[in-house]
Interface confidence: low
C-alpha cells in the first residue's frame, strides 16, 4: 500500500517538474490566444495584428482572417482569437466545410446543374431549394398502390395494396387523415380507387389526344409501349425540363 | 437512388476502390458526396467528402488522409480508393449525397 | 479530433412516450451543422434532422431537434414500435480535416 503511494507521489513530481522545465525551455507556450511568439522580439507575446486571429495559445504566427466578399455574407466577425465565420446572400445557399462555397437556390421541383436551375424529370421530385431531385417511391416494392400521384416538388403517396380495396378485406389502412363517423374503412378505400382510377383514364385520353395532334406517331408509340407511366407529365419537355425518352438515354434525363 | 459496389475479402496490406453509382441523377451538378463506414457492430465513421461537378478540395479524417482517395470517376461514379489495409478497416462502406441519399451499403474484409 | 458524447445505451420508454438523447460535442459545431440519423440493423442510416432542428423531408413531426454551439439534443414524443431503432448525431466543423464526426450511437428500446 505504502509503495503505491509512494509510485503515485513520485509520478505526480515528474509530471509537475515536466511541466515547469518544458516551460522554461518554451517560453512560447506561455502565449495565450490571440497572441503569437515574436521571434524578433526576443519570444515576447504580441497581440495578433489586425486582420489575423489565433485561436490556440503558443503559435508563433496568427492566421489571416477570412474575408465575407461577394456571395459570402459576414455571419460572425474575425476577432484576435476566433477566425470570421461566413454565410450566404438570399437566394444563395452554404456548401461545405466552413461555408466553403455558396450554391444558388432552386424552386421546389428543380435542381441545379451546370446550366442552371433546371426541373425534376419525370419520376422525380425535389421539395427543396436545394440538393437533388429524387425518384419517386416505388409503392409496388411496398405491395402497394398509387393514392396519389407524384408531381416534381411531391413524391407518391403510397395507399393500401390492391388487394386491401377487396370487399370483406380485414385490415384496411387508408393514410387518409380523419375519417368521418359512420363511414367504413372499405367504401372509403373504394371511393378513392373509384375516383382515382377514373381520373387516370381521363388523364390518359386526353393525353394521347394531345399527343396525337401535337407530336405524331413516334410519341403516340411510346405512350402504348410504356401502358403504365403516368402520361401526364409527358408535356414536360415544353417547360424546360432536362428530360429524355429511355430509348434514347439511359436513366431518362440530361444533366 | 445511389448504389455502392467493390466490397470483397481481401488480405492486409492489399488495396481496394469501392464505387458509388447514383442512378436517377447525375453528379455532373454539384453534390457532396461523403463516404461513412461501419464496422460490424460498431457506430459510423466518416471518411471523406467531395464536392462533384466542381474542383473543390475534398475533406478527410484526419486518420484516413493518405491511405484513402475520394475522387469523382465519371458523371455518374465516386470512388474510394484505400491501400495498406488492416483488420482494423473490415466494414460496411456507404455512399451518401449530402446525408440525406445513401446507398445500402457495400461490405469489405480484411483478413488474411 | 472532435468528440460527440451521446446519451448512453440503451435508452427504454413505454408506447406513447417520450425519449430524449443528448448529443454534447468537444468544440462548437459550425453554423448549426448537426444532423441526427436514425438506423435499423442491416439498413443505411436515415436522416431525420438536419441544421440541428430542421425537419428532413417525409419524417414524422414526433422529431424534434433542437439545441446549439456545443449541446444538442433528439426528442422522440408519441414513441411508436418502430422507432426501436440506434440514433446518432453527426456534427461538422469549420476544419478542412475531421470536417465531419459522429456520435457512438444511442439504442432506443421501445416496450
Known amino acids: 500500500m505504502g509503495n503505491s503511494c509512494y509510485n503515485i507521489v513520485a509520478t505526480l513530481l515528474l509530471v509537475l517538474n515536466f511541466e515547469r522545465t518544458r516551460s522554461l525551455q518554451d517560453p512560447c507556450s506561455n502565449c495565450p490566444a490571440g497572441t503569437f511568439c515574436d521571434n524578433n522580439r526576443n519570444q515576447i507575446c504580441s497581440p495578433c495584428p489586425p486582420n489575423s486571429f489565433s485561436s490556440a495559445g503558443g503559435q508563433r504566427t496568427c492566421d489571416i482572417c477570412r474575408q465575407c466578399k461577394g456571395v459570402f455574407r459576414t455571419r460572425k466577425e474575425c476577432s484576435s482569437t476566433s477566425n470570421a465565420e461566413c454565410d450566404c446572400t438570399p437566394g444563395f445557399h452554404c456548401l461545405g466545410a466552413g461555408c466553403s462555397m455558396c450554391e444558388q437556390d432552386c424552386k421546389q421541383g428543380q435542381e441545379l446543374t451546370k446550366k442552371g436551375c433546371k426541373d425534376c424529370c419525370f419520376g422525380t421530385f425535389n421539395d427543396q431549394k436545394r440538393g437533388i431531385c429524387r425518384p419517386w417511391t416505388n409503392c409496388s416494392l411496398d405491395g402497394k398502390s398509387v393514392l396519389v400521384n407524384g408531381t416534381k416538388e411531391r413524391d407518391v403517396v403510397c395507399g393500401p395494396s390492391p388487394a386491401d380495396l377487396s370487399p370483406g378485406a380485414s385490415s384496411v389502412t387508408p393514410p387518409a387523415p380523419a375519417r368521418e363517423p359512420g363511414h367504413s374503412p372499405q367504401i372509403i378505400s373504394f371511393f378513392l380507387a373509384l375516383t382515382s382510377t377514373a381520373l387516370l383514364f381521363l388523364l390518359f385520353f386526353l393525353t394521347l389526344r394531345f399527343s396525337v395532334v401535337k407530336r405524331g406517331r413516334k410519341k403516340l408509340l411510346y405512350i402504348f409501349k410504356q401502358p403504365f407511366m403516368r402520361p401526364v407529365q409527358t408535356t414536360q419537355e415544353e417547360d424546360g425540363c432536362s428530360c429524355r425518352f429511355p430509348e434514347e438515354e439511359e436513366g431518362g434525363c440530361e444533366l | 437512388s445511389l448504389e455502392e459496389s467493390g466490397g470483397d475479402l481481401v488480405k492486409p496490406g492489399a488495396s481496394l476502390t469501392l464505387t458509388c453509382t447514383a442512378s436517377?441523377?447525375?453528379?455532373?451538378?454539384?453534390?457532396?458526396m461523403c463516404w461513412v463506414r461501419q464496422a460490424p457492430g460498431e457506430g459510423l465513421e466518416w471518411i471523406a467528402c467531395?464536392?462533384?461537378?466542381?474542383?473543390?478540395?475534398p475533406h478527410y479524417a484526419s486518420w484516413a488522409k493518405g491511405r484513402f482517395t475520394i475522387s469523382q470517376t465519371s458523371s455518374t461514379t465516386v470512388t474510394l480508393q484505400m491501400t495498406s489495409l488492416t483488420a482494423a478497416d473490415t466494414a460496411t462502406y456507404f455512399c451518401?449525397?449530402?446525408?440525406?441519399?445513401w446507398g445500402p451499403g457495400t461490405l469489405v474484409t480484411v483478413s488474411s | 479530433a472532435q468528440v460527440l458524447t451521446q446519451t448512453a445505451s440503451p435508452v427504454s420508454a413505454a408506447v406513447g412516450g417520450t425519449v430524449t438523447i443528448n448529443c454534447q460535442s468537444s468544440?462548437?459545431?459550425?453554423?448549426?451543422?448537426l444532423s441526427w440519423y436514425q438506423q435499423k440493423p442491416g439498413q443505411p442510416p436515415k436522416r431525420l434532422i438536419y441544421?440541428?432542428?430542421t425537419l428532413a423531408s417525409g419524417v414524422p413531426s414526433r422529431f424534434k431537434g433542437s439545441g446549439s454551439g456545443t449541446q444538442f439534443t433528439l426528442t422522440i414524443s408519441d414513441l411508436e414500435c418502430d422507432d426501436a431503432a440506434t440514433y446518432y448525431c453527426?456534427?461538422?466543423?469549420?476544419?478542412?480535416?475531421?470536417?465531419?464526426?459522429f456520435g457512438r450511437g444511442t439504442e432506443v428500446e421501445v416496450k
Open positions: 468544440q462548437s459545431v459550425y453554423s448549426n451543422w
Open positions: 441544421s440541428a432542428s
Open positions: 436517377g441523377f447525375s453528379f455532373s451538378s454539384r453534390h457532396y
Open positions: 467531395i464536392y462533384t461537378g466542381s474542383s473543390g478540395t
Open positions: 453527426a456534427g461538422g466543423y469549420n476544419t478542412v480535416t475531421d470536417t465531419f464526426a
Open positions: 451518401s449525397s449530402e446525408g440525406n441519399l
